[in-house]
């Protein structure tokens, strides 16, 4: 049920080299260093699970300070083959090639790799994130234009032997960061091919990968305070639930989310917050260093065990899913947004959850591990939390299955 | 410095319509709603709506529901406010203001006139 | 809808003095009031958020107090710039709903 049991050599202990190689900031994405084409050129790009193209940007855009230059790349060959990525708002199209990709603070190998190369974008790029790029760690199943474009963590590990893993701790900064901030500070770590023990505390407790498209995982229950929402469990994970490095928040379906909205309520009713706060459009400020962390609860989402009838549960404090933000407007308060918000396409696991956690992608054996994050915010009366094991029964039926037609697969 | 940099006074016949901009510089775009205000001469400020830049949602006065729709552009993070079937009722001041704790920053004012 | 009722629409005083303006909600709103500065022809200028709180750059002689219904803009110590319109608005839920204003002459 957790990591106690033996692993293969070259899975597990330091990775020095790797530790601390992530920048960014929950709202606007955790980045890292990677190097395209021959010679190499330096880009910082988003770390996302919840996607699957290595994409970057090739063209000039007002919020890029630099671009990948394919004609400047020895190494670089055409697919000759578009690639249109829309989303609910927004979208990106490129050309598909391949080219020679290394990450400096990474494993010490050189792979080659599909590359989008982005000409168009809309809503994209963000103004001030500092990235350029978007590394997709999740599965072929849903790459674009298809599953038959290899994603670069499979072109990795067929390439190389570098172990099919990777781990992430997301470090939360606690306070506003500003642009000078965020360059200079530490985001966190991306651990390819391994665990690294220095990155967290107490035991993985393992949750399968119910399906390799997203990272989809299964919740079986969802406490606030410890009480229980009492929904049928296929609404948590309606239509699926995903670990999702790339979104902010901890996004909850229409039902979770009011049920969840009212029970975070009722349980800071010492406090009166306006409706916007819970849209996440108005902040809620404090006088600095007086933020009431304690009238908040604390979120428990417990996941499906790796045993029969069996979970753990994974707990989130306040100071995970406040998100602080910097407003010149109240530079006198510690301000926050309420960074949990409603979701059309179920649950995402995002920065606000991953960020309490240290993440283990264990690919190789179908499940994605969780421990509590050696860098995650807390106070000195509450700490997030990893615990099991739980007995649940019928967690099978807690699985959405989203209907296939044949249709289903030209959505978007 | 946060700006909000509205376009121009507008002077429009009854029946038609017109469409509002308001620029923001100073501050990532996507990470603050964007309201606009209604002031006519005598008769206070009048909320209209809002829109979140991120993903486009809006919500409405229910009085101004059938009569401003609000858009945004990401790429230049401008906000828009389209005003249909225009009647001297709607001639007034138009504001764009942006979230926070309540409405910390303005744009500077846009004239609509509605005569024939 | 809630609504925001400032009484009185005129006061008059004079540069030192001191000057309160009141807004009533017509439901508790908590503390979830502003208060905004219009001089002629210009934008509303923001002075009071959460009741009582300050935003950045405003002078102390502006504070504001109150919650639940009753709220009270006061200026102590008033100026001659201090010639304006003001508003109060409830953001504590939507539609988010302004008083009338009270428009403050200098004798």
């Known amino acids: 049920e957790t990591d106690e049991e033996p692993e293969e050599p070259g899975r597990r202990g330091s990775f020095v080299e790797m530790v601390d190689n992530l920048r960014g900031k929950s709202g606007q994405g955790y980045y890292v260093e990677m190097t395209v084409g021959s010679p190499p050129q330096t880009l910082n790009i988003l770390v996302d699970t919840g996607s699957s193209n290595f994409a970057v940007g090739a063209a000039p855009h007002p919020f890029l300070h630099r671009y990948y230059q394919r004609q400047l790349s020895s190494t670089y060959r055409d697919l000759r083959k578009g690639v249109y990525v829309p989303y609910t708002q927004g979208k990106w199209e490129g050309e598909l090639g391949t080219d020679l990709v290394s990450i400096p603070h990474g494993p010490n190998v050189t792979v080659r790799a599909n590359i989008a190369a982005i000409t168009e974008s809309d809503k994209f790029f963000i103004n001030g994130s500092n990235w350029e790029g978007i590394l997709g760690l999740a599965y072929a199943e849903i790459a674009r234009p298809d599953d038959s474009l290899e994603p670069f963590f499979d072109s990795l590990v067929k390439q190389t032997h570098v172990p099919n893993l990777f781990s992430l701790q997301l470090c939360g900064a606690g306070f506003p960061l500003n642009q000078s901030e965020v360059l200079a500070s530490v985001g966190g770590s991306m651990i390819i091919g391994g665990i690294d023990h220095s990155l967290y505390t107490g035991s993985l407790w393992y949750t399968p990968i119910r399906r390799e498209w997203y990272y989809e995982v299964i919740i079986v229950r969802v406490e606030i305070n410890g009480q229980d929402l009492k929904m049928d469990c296929k609404e948590y994970n309606y239509d699926k639930s995903i670990v999702d490095s790339g979104t902010t928040n901890l996004r909850l379906p229409k039902k979770v989310f009011e049920a969840a909205v009212k029970s975070i309520k009722a349980a800071s009713s010492t406090e009166k917050f306006p409706d916007g706060f819970w849209l996440g459009e108005q902040l809620v400020c404090w006088q600095a260093g007086t933020t009431p962390w304690n009238i908040f609860p604390v979120i428990s989402l417990y996941l499906m065990g790796e045993v029969t009838n069996q979970s753990f549960r994974i707990t989130i404090l306040p100071q995970q899913y406040l998100r602080p933000v910097e407003d010149v407007a109240t530079s006198q308060d510690d301000c926050y947004k309420f960074a949990i918000s409603q979701s059309s396409t179920g649950t995402v696991m995002g920065a606000v959850i991953m960020e309490g956690f240290y993440v283990v992608f264990d690919r190789a054996r179908k499940r994605i591990g969780f421990a509590v994050s050696a860098c995650h915010v807390h106070d000195e009366f509450r700490t997030a939390a990893v615990e099991g094991p739980f007995v649940t029964l019928d967690m099978e039926d807690c699985g959405y299955n989203i209907p296939q037609t044949d249709e289903s697969t030209l959505m978007t | 410095e946060v700006q909000l940099q509205q376009s121009g006074a507008e002077l429009v016949r009854p029946g038609t319509s017109v469409k509002l901009s308001c620029k923001a510089s100073?501050?990532?775009?996507?990470s603050y709603w964007i309201h606009w205000v209604k002031q006519r001469p005598g008769q206070g400020l009048e909320w209209i709506g809002m829109i979140d830049p991120s993903d486009s949602y809006t919500k409405y006065n229910q009085k101004f529901k059938d009569k401003a729709t609000l858009t945004v552009d990401t790429s230049s993070s401008t906000t828009y406010m389209h005003l249909s079937s225009l009647t001297s009722e709607d001639s007034a001041v138009y504001y764009c203001a942006r979230s926070g704790v309540a409405f910390p920053y303005w744009g500077q004012r846009t004239l609509v006139t509605v005569s024939a | 809808d809630i609504q925001m009722t400032q009484s009185q629409k005129f006061m008059s005083k004079s540069v030192g003095d001191r000057v309160s303006v009141t807004c009533k909600a017509s439901?508790?709103?908590?503390?979830?009031v502003a208060w905004y500065q219009q001089k002629s022809g210009q934008s509303p200028k923001s002075l009071i958020y959460s009741a009582s709180h300050r935003y950045s750059g405003v002078p102390d002689r502006f504070t504001g107090s109150g919650s639940g219904t009753d709220f009270t803009l006061t200026i102590s110590n008033v100026q001659s710039e201090d010639l304006a319109d003001y508003f109060c608005q409830q953001y504590n839920s939507y539609p988010y709903t302004f008083g009338g204003g009270t428009r403050l002459e200098i004798k």
């Open positions: 439901q508790n709103v908590g503390s979830n």
């Open positions: 100073g501050y990532t775009f996507t």
